[in-house]
């Protein structure tokens, strides 16, 4: 058993049929010694008396808010949550496996630049009685500070018969050094509580590996005289790290016909313009990637040819 | 050329070669070994590879103030990785494919380090890996880790040289 926060405790249980459970001793936070009784949740049934209460925690029915009273007055509370371990593996019932980039990916994180700011998100099908708490640091043995905001519900989607809820959180490294080569990864830890079930999820990454630039901006076409060719130009996204002579991007320019089956023409360039042939009803798209480190491509910025 | 104590390197040449290094480092990894890499424990990355850290002067402001600190750090890293890529981690079994880019990568690391420090000039305090023989069963994981680490190192080096070529070239 360990303390998650004041008056909230997590009991770690090996979860299998007829498991013996964990013996837990609760102590009433009071100077009083006599006439103390204990109840669980809203029930008025007295579970025991005395300053301490010993219980055997085996299942969710044994978890909940234990309250000690004296003469009708509440003295203190202890909320017990359960953390299940099945076959040596902690349960992951609350969050959905996003399976990208690999199985057992519950948290996904992205950064738009090297400033030390990043966003993480996760999915669940649970809509109520759900709380999240997020902590982060750079490194684990001698952790350096990363400040995370509160997790918020950022999207709702319908998937078949189920509703899916996306939560996200923004974090910022306290003393970021955008030009340095990271040697210690960022660690993100999410505590999830659904009713009386506790779970924790972690992710470890370098900012460089989660970089995904915003799409190029101000995408424009300029027809070239007496030619089917056009000059496409664009600019670095505002959110990208500066100076651009140091934090350089590379670009992919694509000409795509109306039909998905039509052959795509692609050009790769380090410049912020390119000359391509504009076909009727086609569109021109440009995306960006860090020039020197192969992290994710941005989403496409597109303009129609006509 | 970055002569100790002073003059500028051939920024544009360094930029071109460092960008080539980036491409090679990514084409060399993941290496096709004789078997799949299983998920391995996160033990410390091999041989305490040198990292370009915050105080090394490799940020745009640091380069403007005095690029020598940064260039020395890059040079140390290049020599370190050149030694690693020439070690039995890469020359031993499981053998690399004959057309593996590791050979080119190895040669390019040497080439860039020589551009930064021609024969006869010496920056002190080289951090050289102490390379005891690696067991064959460790090598795939070591290669994987070294190349991942090298990708990050050469990315920073390439940014330095790109910025230098754009803003510090005579």
């Amino acid at each position: 058993i360990w303390e998650l926060k004041k008056d909230v405790y997590v009991v770690e249980l090996d979860w299998y049929p007829d498991a013996p459970g964990e013996m837990v001793v609760l102590t009433c936070d009071t100077p009083e010694e006599d006439g103390i009784t204990w109840t669980l949740d809203q029930s008025s049934e007295v579970l025991g008396s005395g300053k301490t209460l010993t219980i055997q925690v085996k299942e969710f029915g044994d978890a909940g808010q234990y309250t000690c009273h004296k003469g009708g007055e509440v003295l203190s509370h202890s909320l017990l949550l359960l953390h299940k371990k099945e076959d040596g593996i902690w349960s992951t019932d609350i969050l959905k496996d996003q399976k990208e980039p690999k199985n057992k990916t519950f948290l996904r994180c992205e950064a738009k630049n090297y400033s030390g700011r990043f966003t993480c998100w996760w999915l669940t099908t649970i809509s109520t009685d759900l709380t999240f708490s997020v902590k982060s640091s750079r490194g684990s043995s001698d952790p350096q500070g990363v400040t995370c905001g509160a997790a918020t519900l950022s999207a709702e989607r319908v998937r078949g018969d189920n509703k899916e809820y996306e939560y996200s959180v923004e974090c910022q490294e306290d003393s970021a050094c955008p030009a340095a080569e990271e040697s210690l990864p960022i660690e993100v830890m999410v505590d999830a509580v659904h009713k009386l079930k506790y779970e924790n999820y972690t992710s470890s990454f370098f900012i460089r590996d989660i970089i995904k630039p915003d799409p190029p901006k101000n995408l424009q076409l300029k027809p070239l005289k007496n030619s089917r060719q056009v000059e496409v130009s664009w600019e670095y996204p505002d959110t990208w790290s500066t100076p651009h002579s140091y934090f350089s991007l590379t670009f992919c320019v694509q000409v795509q016909g109306k039909s998905k089956r039509e052959k795509k023409d692609r050009v790769f360039t380090d410049k912020t313009s390119a000359t391509v042939i504009c076909r009727k009803n086609a569109s021109i798209s440009v995306r960006a990637q860090d020039r020197y480190y192969s992290s994710s491509w941005s989403e496409w910025a597109s303009v129609p040819c006509s | 050329r970055a002569v100790p104590g002073g003059s500028s390197p051939a920024w544009t040449q360094c930029q071109q070669l460092s960008q080539k290094l980036c491409t090679l480092a990514w084409s060399a990894h993941p290496l096709v070994g004789h078997m799949d890499l299983r998920e391995e424990g996160d033990e410390e990355t091999t041989n305490d590879v040198p990292h370009i850290q915050c105080g090394d002067g490799c940020d745009p402001q640091g380069l403007r103030d005095n690029s020598q600190f940064c260039l020395q750090r890059i040079h140390q890293g290049l020599i370190f990785y050149e030694k690693l890529l020439g070690s039995d981690i890469f020359t031993g079994e499981p053998s690399l494919l004959p057309d593996s880019p590791v050979g080119q990568l190895h040669a390019s690391l040497l080439g860039l380090s020589q551009l930064l420090q021609p024969e006869g000039h010496h920056w002190e305090t080289q951090q050289i890996p102490s390379l005891s023989p690696s067991q064959p069963w460790q090598r795939l994981l070591l290669r994987f880790k070294i190349l991942r680490s090298l990708q990050a190192f050469v990315a920073v080096a390439a940014r330095v040289f790109a910025h230098g070529a754009a803003t510090l070239s005579p």
Partner: antibody, heavy 115, light 107 residues
Framework: QVQLVQSGAEVKKPGASVKVSCKAS????????IHWVRQAPGQGLEWMGY????????NYNEKFKGRVTMTTDTSTSTAYMELRSLRSDDTAVYYC????????WGQGTLVTVSS | DIQMTQSPSSLSASVGDRVTITCRAS??????LHWYQQKPGKAPKLLIY???QSISGVPSRFSGSGSGTDFTLTISSLQPEDFATYYC?????????FGQGTKVEIK
């Protein structure tokens, strides 16, 4: 094509030294290790050690440490194995081989130690 | 050191027979096991590497299997040129060690 060509047979007296050469051709010499293996008459194979031509790093079988020295001359793409303080039970065919998972061995050099 | 034990030490077989040679390592060597064929007066010739991977130019009748400590070399249909001594080798860790050999003779 890849070839490893070894020096000719040697007859040595007990206590002497022998140096066997292995000339490589048909590939970039410093890209692979050179292993040395020996086989006593009618016996099995015994690994002696390897050298990395790229940095002259060696790894010797404990059994031969102190008696064996492996070297290379990269200018001629040649590897050498010197065995000192020869005894009669060092009589064997000595082979050089490129990485185990590469199917390239020298033809062998018979070293006879006899008084 | 990892001991490599081959069995049988020798066997007699006829052309066309299916022949199986086993090799046991004294501790796990994953799939870092190689098989060689050696004929009198010749250098060993690599047949199979990393337990089951075939070498170009080696007939497909030679195959390997196993992992950990127990390995097998199979010759699906013995040919006259296959009469030789076969060795397995630990390619996992130093010192590299070989089995004592299995001599395949004509019945």
């Amino acid at each position: 094509q890849v070839q490893l060509v070894q020096s000719g047979a040697e007859v040595k007296k007990p206590g002497a030294s022998v140096k066997v050469s292995c000339k490589a051709s048909g590939y970039t010499f410093n890209r692979y290790l050179i292993h040395w293996v020996r086989q006593a008459p009618g016996q099995g194979l015994e690994w002696m050690g390897y050298i990395n031509p790229n940095n002259a790093g060696t790894n010797y079988n404990e059994k031969f440490k102190g008696r064996v020295t492996m070297t290379t001359d990269t200018s001629t793409s040649t590897a050498y194995m010197e065995l000192r303080s020869l005894r009669s039970d060092d009589t064997a065919v000595y082979y050089c081989a490129r990485n185990w998972d590469q199917a390239y061995w020298g033809q062998g050099t018979l070293v006879t130690v006899s008084s | 050191d990892i001991q490599m034990t081959q069995s049988p030490s020798s066997l007699s077989a006829s052309v066309g027979d299916r022949v199986t040679i086993t090799c046991r390592a004294s501790q796990s060597i994953s799939d870092y096991l190689h098989w060689y064929q050696q004929k009198p007066g010749k250098a060993p010739k690599l047949l199979i590497y990393y337990t089951s991977q075939s070498i170009s130019g080696v007939p497909s009748r030679f195959s390997g299997s196993g992992s950990g400590t127990d390995f097998t070399l199979t010759i699906s249909s013995l040919q006259p040129e296959d009469f030789a001594t076969y060795y397995c080798q630990n390619g996992h860790s130093f010192p590299f060690t070989f089995g004592q050999g299995t001599k395949v003779e004509i019945k």
